[in-house]
Amino acid sequence: QKSSIEKCSVDIQQSRNKTTERPGLLNCPIYWQQLREKCLLFSHTVNPWNNSLADCSTKESSLLLIRDKDELIHTQNLIRDKAILFWIGLNFSLSEKNWKWINGSFLNSNDLEIRGDAKENSCISISQTSVYSEYCSTEIRWICQKELTPVRNKVYPDS
């Protein structure tokens, strides 16, 4: 039995997979910030987690996926105040009783030190300093990401 949030996450991911292939992204769009091989958009408004998920999808992006602690720290360095919370693409899967990224992978327990409960209707937010489990219905800001396409160096013959 999937929760409504899990269904929403799966539906959006499937609809994204059905879309036609777009050319790779070489530069970040206006208002997006580059962080290594990603473009990040920090919202100024607030939403519950599932609305945030949907908003990123409409922007042809996804809620932020964090690979490791290093990426977390670099992302947190872009947050300007300690009293701002941002949703990321991680929520509690009731069926699998584990934290699950919206791309279907499970959280490696060493990646993020989550403060708070792992239970139904819990979603993950980040602040300038920490990672929190919050109720998914809470209206806070969110971070969307787009992957940048790596540009391979072309070798030109001498002219």
Epitope: H44, V46, R80, D81, K82, A83, I84, L85, R115, G116, D117, S127, S130, Y132, S133, E134, Y135, S137, T138, E139, I140
Partner: antibody
Framework: EVQLVESGGGLVQPGGSLRLSCAAS????????MSWVRQAPGKGLEWVSA????????YYADSVKGRFTISRDNSKNTLYLQMNSLRAEDTAVYYC????????????WGQGTLVTVSS | DIQMTQSPSSLSASVGDRVAITCRAS??????LNWYQQKPGKAPKLLIY???SLQSGVPSRFSGSGSGTDFTLTISSLQPEDFATYYC?????????FGQGTKVEIK
């Protein structure tokens, strides 16, 4: 209807302690950040502390950091403020208010509870 | 910390008057500015959030404008129940700070 009702105020000696409570009803308490805001007699409003919906994240004004602790019990729909090492300048009406994480406004307020610190 | 400065500190006006209260931030706060009304012995009440959005249930004679550092609360036609103290507050950065208040009195 959203309601916030504070209690626990009173007269306390300098250096003493007091715990304020705020009972919330009419909304999904656990989904909202909450704050304490105070107002000294005849003065303006001063934000004191805030806590996230889950209670995992808290922050404080410099004037109370290390002396006051904000907490919440979502099963009881109640917000708390534990006040230790009280000073005369802490004398004020203490309001609990919904909101406090950026960019929230304080959209609902309790009626306030008076804390008097005096010997 | 961001300082919020209101002017005037107090004003006298008559019923039906148009009243404007200004609030200046010590640095840019974009549109993260809220206005509250407080009557003696009562809790503050949110009137305007995000500089210009009217809180639900608040009469349309109240309006807010501005962005960056300069903001204005306007009461288009003062009513007897509007005599109170008004506070601005920034929700751009911590600590959250309020203006010192503007008392609107009966002339």
């Amino acid at each position: 209807e959203v309601q916030l009702v504070e209690s626990g105020g009173g007269l306390v000696q300098p250096g003493g302690s007091l715990r304020l409570s705020c009972a919330a009803s009419g909304f999904t308490f656990s989904s909202y950040a909450m704050s304490w805001v105070r107002q000294a007699p005849g003065k303006g409003l001063e934000w004191v502390s805030a806590i996230s919906g889950s209670g995992g994240s808290t922050y404080y004004a410099d004037s109370v950091k290390g002396r006051f602790t904000i907490s919440r019990d979502n099963s009881k729909n109640t917000l708390y403020l534990q006040m230790n090492s009280l000073r005369a300048e802490d004398t004020a009406v203490y309001y609990c208010a919904r909101g406090g994480y950026l960019p929230d406004a304080f959209d609902y307020w309790g009626q306030g509870t008076l804390v008097t610190v005096s010997s | 910390d961001i300082q919020m400065t209101q002017s005037p500190s107090s004003l006298s006006a008559s019923v039906g008057d148009r009243v404007a209260i200004t609030c200046r931030a010590s640095q840019s706060i974009s549109s993260y500015l809220n206005w509250y009304q407080q009557k003696p012995g009562k809790a503050p009440k949110l009137l305007i959030y995000a500089a210009s959005s009217l809180q639900s249930g608040v009469p349309s004679r109240f309006s807010g404008s501005g962005s960056g550092t300069d903001f204005t609360l306007t009461i288009s036609s003062l009513q007897p129940e509007d005599f109170a103290t008004y506070y601005c507050q920034q929700s751009y950065s911590t600590p959250l700070t309020f203006g010192q208040g503007t008392k609107v009195e009966i002339k």
